[in-house]
């Protein structure tokens, strides 16, 4: 990139520029014409016969350097060929001499600084590539000449130009003073500002683009040349900050469209909202999620949003006693999340109908909540107990819902305490043929004992067939039809409104061998 | 501004020669292009011929060849035009003009003439 | 030499008409063609260099086009003031300066 600090070419009014010295043949200005036809202003000297020696001087006016530390002079200029020139001296030349001054300010005057090699600083000495001649009975026929001349290194705030001719017939048709500068670049989201540099090479610090992020590593810089040119070199660069993708080329970060997002910064493109997510505005990170579905506060932020699951469905319960087996079938919407567990809820209702939550007594196995598998086994059910059950279905954002949870309820009613086990049997009296037993009357807790049932079989014949029931309704029984001297063994349950209790333990007992030891009491 | 100030009005026999001067007043002369038109009474114009002083030698139209010498002073600013075997169909006004770029001064080698003398009568009569 | 013919040999016209006058070279001159005004007992005055290049201080209503063999030039609107006679002229690199026999304007 190339910073004009003169352009003749754009001057419209006079240049009045400073000559030296003031006498006839000296540089002179005129009105020219460029090859756009345009109207240019120029300078022109043409003293070929002049004494050797002498100098005629044009000096620009005062250039501020504006920073630059090297500037470079295009020269366009027109020469005559000395052969062409009948009455043209030896002191004819073909070439002029360019150099600066530098200062501070615009001090220069008409004698100052002295017209001179030091302290003017000679630039170089300018020969002409093309030189316009003329021979007799044809026209003159020349070509402009085009010569670029770098000034430099420059401290002070500006300078002046100058040239000197000895002896040349040219004119100087356009000086176009510029220095060179590394234009404003953007590359990889990184913007380098635009540079003019002070050496070969001058290293620029970038800094990222709106709505980028500098990436891991060093930060990113990018070589100014002298030439204005910037340096091939990679660049670590910035990458978009969430929310924002590159665009135009890696030159700038768009904000993610309504209905996109992008989570993290760095390279990658913003992606449509995952499922049951929005987001109603541009540049997002994160989609909102709709009303009802949730993310917990696991899942990464381009997750899909989900929702709690349904209800389990169809509880089978199976009472044993004090145990019961709960099973269920998973819920028909798992939310669309794999972090299916299961909980449950109790409360029981005793017989004269309060209720409250189940008490501590009861367990759970495997537990009552945080289950995996669709069943439990609770133990410790008391009897005459109703238990409700509710079966819930949790997932990873149950917990942030609101509302009701939804539930599988399931009623179970234990039957009411029966009697306990007729223990301590013992045998009144012993015959040959009969038994005549007693035992303790059992405590029955719901209710009292409406009867007894007592079972006996011979030792030995352990068959179904072999196996004999009575019922009384007292706590004692006579067994009769027994065979003589055989071993009998005797268990009772007691009966009350619940129903019977557990057998008790087998009682062993034997009739007598013959009718004469007659009736014999046996006491426990 | 360049001013061109031609010589008076000339009388001459036919068969004679007449020479008109024209001088420029003021900055570069010597690469300016100065030519010579004519222009006879109730006529259009006629260019006759041009010269750069700084290269000597003038160009002439194929008509005015060998009768007519067009030379130039850079010391005193000052070209001539010597016109020779006058005839009677001479007469004429005879203006010098100065083209508008010098030799080094335009892209193109345009010979545009922005300056003219006032004009000499020359009167060719026996 | 290259001849130079310019059409009408004159014309009448009115103030505020558009005005065209032609130059025909009898061979290619690309576009080295000058375009002078001269009013009578004046010298000739350079309106148009270059074919189309209106010279300093012309009107702009004054305007020149053409290229190689055929030229115009046109007054867009014609002021009192204008009425003269017109010249084209030739230049090339082979020495002379052709006029054409020109063009008088007259008020209609």
């Known amino acids: 990139l190339e910073e004009t600090l003169l352009n003749t070419k754009l001057e419209t009014a006079d240049l009045k520029w400073v000559t030296f010295p003031q006498v006839d043949g000296q540089w002179e200005e005129l009105s020219g014409l460029d090859e756009e036809q345009h109207s240019v202003r120029t300078y022109e000297v043409c003293d070929v016969q002049r004494a050797p020696g002498q100098a005629h001087w044009l000096r620009t006016g005062w250039v501020p350097r504006r920073g630059a530390v090297h500037v470079y002079a295009t020269l366009r200029f027109t020469m005559l060929e000395c052969l062409s020139l009948p009455r043209a001296g030896r002191s004819c030349k073909e070439t002029f001499t360019v150099f600066y001054y530098e200062s501070d300010a615009d001090t220069a005057t008409a004698l100052t600084p002295a017209w001179m090699e030091n302290p003017y600083i000679k630039v170089d000495t300018v020969a002409a590539e093309h030189l316009t001649r003329k021979r007799p009975g044809a026209e003159a026929t020349g070509k402009v000449n085009v010569k670029t001349l770098r000034l430099g290194p420059l401290s002070k705030a500006g300078f002046y130009l100058a040239f000197q001719d000895q002896g040349a017939c040219m004119a100087l048709l356009s000086l176009h003073l510029f220095y060179k500068k590394c234009a404003q670049l953007t590359v990889n989201l990184t913007r380098f500002p635009e540079t003019v540099p002070r050496e070969l090479v001058v290293p620029v610090a970038g800094s990222c683009v709106v709505d980028a992020v500098p990436a891991p590593g060093p930060s990113p810089s990018l070589y100014c040349r002298e030439d204005g040119q910037w340096a091939e070199q990679p660049v670590t660069g910035c990458s978009c900050a969430p929310g924002f993708e590159a665009a135009e080329g890696n030159t700038k970060c768009r904000a993610c469209a309504q209905g996109t997002f992008k989570p993290l910064s760095g390279e990658g493109s913003c992606q449509p909202c995952p499922a049951n997510s929005h987001s109603n505005t541009i540049g997002s990170a994160v989609c909102q999620c709709r009303v009802g579905y949730f993310r917990a506060r696991t899942d990464p932020r381009g997750a899909p949003c989900t929702t709690p699951p349904s209800a389990p469905r169809s509880v089978v319960s199976r009472l044993n006693g004090s145990s019961l087996h709960l099973e269920w079938s998973a819920p028909l919407e798992s939310g669309g999340r794999e972090d299916l567990t299961y909980a449950l809820r109790c409360r029981e209702c005793r017989p004269g109908g309060s209720c409250a939550p189940c008490g501590g007594d009861l367990t759970f196995d495997p537990g009552p909540r945080d289950l995996v598998e669709p069943w439990v086994v609770v133990r410790g059910l008391r009897p005459d107990f109703t238990y409700t059950f509710e079966v819930t279905a949790l997932n990873g954002v149950s917990s942030l819902a609101t509302g009701p949870v939804p539930f599988e309820p399931v009623n179970v009613t234990t039957d009411r305490e029966v009697p306990p086990a007729v223990s301590d049997i013992r045998v009144t009296r012993s015959s040959p043929s009969s038994l005549s037993l007693a035992w303790a009357v059992p405590r029955a807790p719901s209710g009292a004992v409406l009867d007894y049932e007592v079972k006996y079989h011979e030792k030995g014949a352990e068959g179904p067939s072999s196996v004999r029931f009575l019922k009384t309704s007292e706590n004692r029984a006579e067994l009769r039809g027994l065979k003589r001297g055989a071993s009998y063994l005797v268990q009772v349950r007691a009966r009350s409104e619940a129903g019977y209790g557990p057998f008790g333990q087998e009682h062993h007992s034997q009739t007598q061998l013959d009718e004469s030891e007659g009736w014999r009491e046996q006491l426990a | 501004q360049v001013q061109l100030v031609q010589s008076g009005a000339e009388v001459k026999k036919p068969g004679s020669s007449v020479k008109v001067s024209c001088k420029a007043s003021?900055?570069?002369?010597?690469?300016?292009?100065i030519s010579w038109v004519r222009q006879a009474p109730g006529q259009g114009l006629e260019w006759m011929g041009k010269i750069i002083p700084i290269f000597g030698d003038a160009d002439y139209a194929q008509k005015f060849q060998g009768r007519v010498t067009i030379t130039a002073d850079e010391s005193t600013s000052t070209a001539y035009m010597e016109l020779s075997s006058l005839r009677s169909e001479d007469t004429a006004v005879y203006y010098c003009a100065r083209s508008s770029y010098t030799i080094l001064t335009t892209y193109y080698n345009y010979n545009a003439m922005d300056n003219w003398g006032q004009g000499t009568l020359v009167t060719v009569s026996s | 030499d290259i001849q130079m013919t310019q059409s009408p040999s004159s014309l009448s016209a009115s103030v505020g008409d558009r005005v065209t006058i032609t130059c025909r070279a009898s061979q290619n001159i690309n576009n080295f063609l000058n375009w002078y005004q001269q009013k009578p007992g004046k010298a000739p005055k350079l309106l148009i260099y270059?074919?189309?290049i209106l010279q300093s201080g012309v009107p702009s209503r004054f305007s020149g086009s053409g290229s190689g063999t055929d030229f115009t030039l046109t007054i867009s609107s014609l002021q009192p003031e204008d009425f003269a006679t017109y010249y084209c002229q030739q230049y090339d690199f082979y020495l002379s300066g052709t006029f054409g026999q020109g063009t008088k304007v007259e008020i209609k």
């Open positions: 003021g900055g570069t002369f010597s690469t300016y292009a």
């Open positions: 270059g074919s189309s």
